[in-house]
């Protein structure tokens, strides 16, 4: 059994997340994850899911009753999702911590928008003509 | 020239994002994107970047002066990043809209944690024995 299982069970007790009513109104993450089989699509979704859990854990970081559980799960996420690569984790954290209401951040984001957009599709790495062909229907990942 | 370029230039004017001082203290996104060549790593980072821009655009959605520009750019993101796949975009939006302070959402998230964790690494799709081998150093994605 992976180490996170016991700690996740501890969190379930703490949050009363084992109660039958928790399953009402569908799932938050599981149904969405089932929709996406392509690795790159899964990463798009998992990126949001992981940032949600990190925010959740941050809100409860000073609660001694679950601190060990939270730390174990965070460590496990770092091994599994970030491949134990601290640079990857640090870059991810930077992105999640930018404040969308900070006017300096807004200006920088808009300043960088053209270059960000140019790199958004995997096609960005190949020639322009090839790219326009792809957008004419060459691509069929779903 | 891609349609977003003209509209992004319009946003730059609106936010005074063409001023020389905008480049002070490094980039928000561009240096991070340069660090990651693997497609799945890029998607992890781009997922956060796209959600940032969507939040930013939401904050300015009622401003008539940039409404057309914002709509054009969002449409272009949908084509490039979400492959014109509305289901992908909808799932992404759901994930970005969950409130981390809502106790029902917290309980659901904790309830689903074990299953989410089990799927976090690409190794999750293969047998348990193979996964433990991978963590013993079999993997070399970069």
């Amino acid at each position: 059994q992976d180490p996170y299982v016991k700690e996740a069970e501890n969190l379930k007790k703490y949050f009363n997340a084992g109660d039958p009513d928790v399953a009402d109104n569908g799932t938050l993450f599981l149904d969405i994850l089932r929709n996406w089989k392509e690795e790159s699509d899964r990463k798009i979704m998992q990126s949001q899911i992981v940032s949600f859990y990190f925010k959740l854990f941050k809100n409860f970081k000073d609660d001694q009753r679950i601190q060990k559980s939270v730390e174990t799960i965070k460590e496990d996420i770092n091994v599994k999702f970030f491949n134990s690569n601290k640079k990857k984790r640090d870059d991810f954290e930077k992105l999640t911590n930018y404040s969308v209401t900070d006017s300096n951040v807004q200006r920088k984001a808009v300043h960088e928008l053209i270059q960000v957009m140019a790199e958004l599709s995997p096609a960005a790495k190949i020639g322009k003509r090839k790219r326009s062909q792809m957008f004419r229907g060459r691509r069929a990942s779903q | 020239q891609d349609p977003y370029v003209k509209e992004a230039e319009n946003l730059k004017k609106y936010f005074n994002a063409g001023d020389p001082d905008v480049a002070d203290n490094g980039t928000l996104f561009l240096d991070i994107l340069r660090n990651w060549k693997e497609e799945s790593d890029r998607k992890i980072m781009q997922s956060q970047i796209v959600s940032f821009y969507f939040k930013l655009f939401k904050n300015f959605k009622d401003d008539q002066r940039i409404q057309k520009s914002v709509e054009t750019i969002k449409e272009d993101i949908n084509v490039k990043f979400f492959n014109s796949n509305k289901k992908k975009r909808d799932d992404f939006e759901k994930l970005t809209n969950y409130s981390v302070t809502d106790s029902n959402v917290q309980r659901k998230a904790v309830h689903e944690l074990i299953q989410v964790m089990a799927e976090l690494s690409p190794a999750a799709k293969i047998g348990k024995r193979k996964r433990s081998q991978m963590f013993r150093g079999r993997r070399a994605s970069q």
């Epitope: 992976d2 180490p3 996170y4 060990k68 939270v70 730390e71 174990t72 965070k74 460590e75 496990d76 770092n78 091994v79 491949n83 134990s84 690569n85 601290k86 640079k87 990857k88 984790r89 640090d90 954290e93 | 340069r34 660090n35 990651w36 060549k37 693997e38 790593d41 991978m134 963590f135 013993r136 150093g137 079999r138 993997r139 070399a140 994605s141 970069q142």
Partner: antibody
Framework: EVQLVESGGGLVKPGDSLTVSCVAS????????IHWVRQAPGKGLEWVAT????????FYSDSLRGRFTVSRDNAANSVYLHMSSLRGEDTALYYC?????????????????WGRGTLVTVSS | NFMLTQPLSVSGYPGKTIVISCVRS????????VQWFQQRPGSAPAMVIY?????PSGIPDRFSGSVDASSNSASLTISGLKTEDEADYFC??????????FGGGTKLTVLG
């Protein structure tokens, strides 16, 4: 003050087994990954294995996997490296090194703190 | 196979600046942090640069680290060379999942 103290080295014959130990102090041991790094006489540094903190995942050098096993006892602030089927080329100074705390995004640097090493000599 | 390649030896006069390179053979150098270690004879390695360009406390600002994606390499620069800088220097990075990788080491000789 962070301290890592290795022990258990010595002279062994080819084919024998040996376990070297490392006792840590001065930090919350269970939070940190621990690496084993070795250095043959007059040679460079070679990473051997790593064990994660609370989750105890094991990572090995491709060239050593199968013969070496890393483990830890968080209650005893200790980490162990069990080496079997030892060969002459395993003769080296074995260092215990503190890694990252991967549960903390502000963790101190990886490989910042090293022990003084324990010498393993494999010879007939 | 992943390798970090360093020059076998580098030398310089006191007060001068030397640069030790560390070239990554495959994968992107920018995708993993790079550390640098100094090792004097009979001592354990001591970190002089961590996470590409940061100095641990107690390391003078004569030591600096950088990464250049275009050459897929990292560099350690030591300015105002001193005789006590004479030592072996190792770069270190990662590949895969927590696989630690060391360069072969560079012997720095301070001349004169």
């Amino acid at each position: 003050e962070v301290q890592l103290v290795e022990s258990g080295g010595g002279l062994v014959k080819p084919g024998d087994s040996l376990t070297v130990s490392c006792v840590a102090s001065g930090f919350t041991f269970s939070n940190y990954f621990i690496h084993w790094v070795r250095q043959a006489p007059g040679k460079g540094l070679e990473w051997v294995a790593t064990i994660s903190g609370r989750t105890k995942y094991m990572f090995y050098s491709d060239s050593l996997r199968g013969r070496f096993t890393v483990s830890r006892d968080n209650a005893a602030n200790s980490v162990y490296l069990h080496m079997s089927s030892l060969r002459g080329e395993d003769t080296a100074l074995y260092y215990c090194v503190r890694g990252y705390d991967h549960s903390d995004s502000n963790s101190a640097a990886d490989l910042l703190h090293w022990g003084r090493g324990t010498l393993v000599t494999v010879s007939s | 196979n992943f390798m970090l390649t360093q020059p076998l030896s580098v030398s310089g006069y006191p007060g001068k600046t030397i640069v030790i390179s560390c070239v990554r053979s495959s994968g992107s150098v920018a995708s993993h942090y790079v550390q640098w270690f100094q090792q004097r004879p009979g001592s354990a390695p001591a970190m002089v640069i961590y996470e590409d360009s940061h100095r641990p406390s107690g390391i003078p600002d004569r030591f600096s680290g950088s990464v250049d994606a275009s050459s897929n390499s990292a560099s350690l620069t030591i300015s105002g060379l001193k005789t006590e800088d004479e030592a072996d220097y190792f770069c270190q990075s990662y590949y895969g999942n927590n696989q630690v990788l060391f360069g072969g080491g560079t012997k720095l000789t301070v001349l004169g």
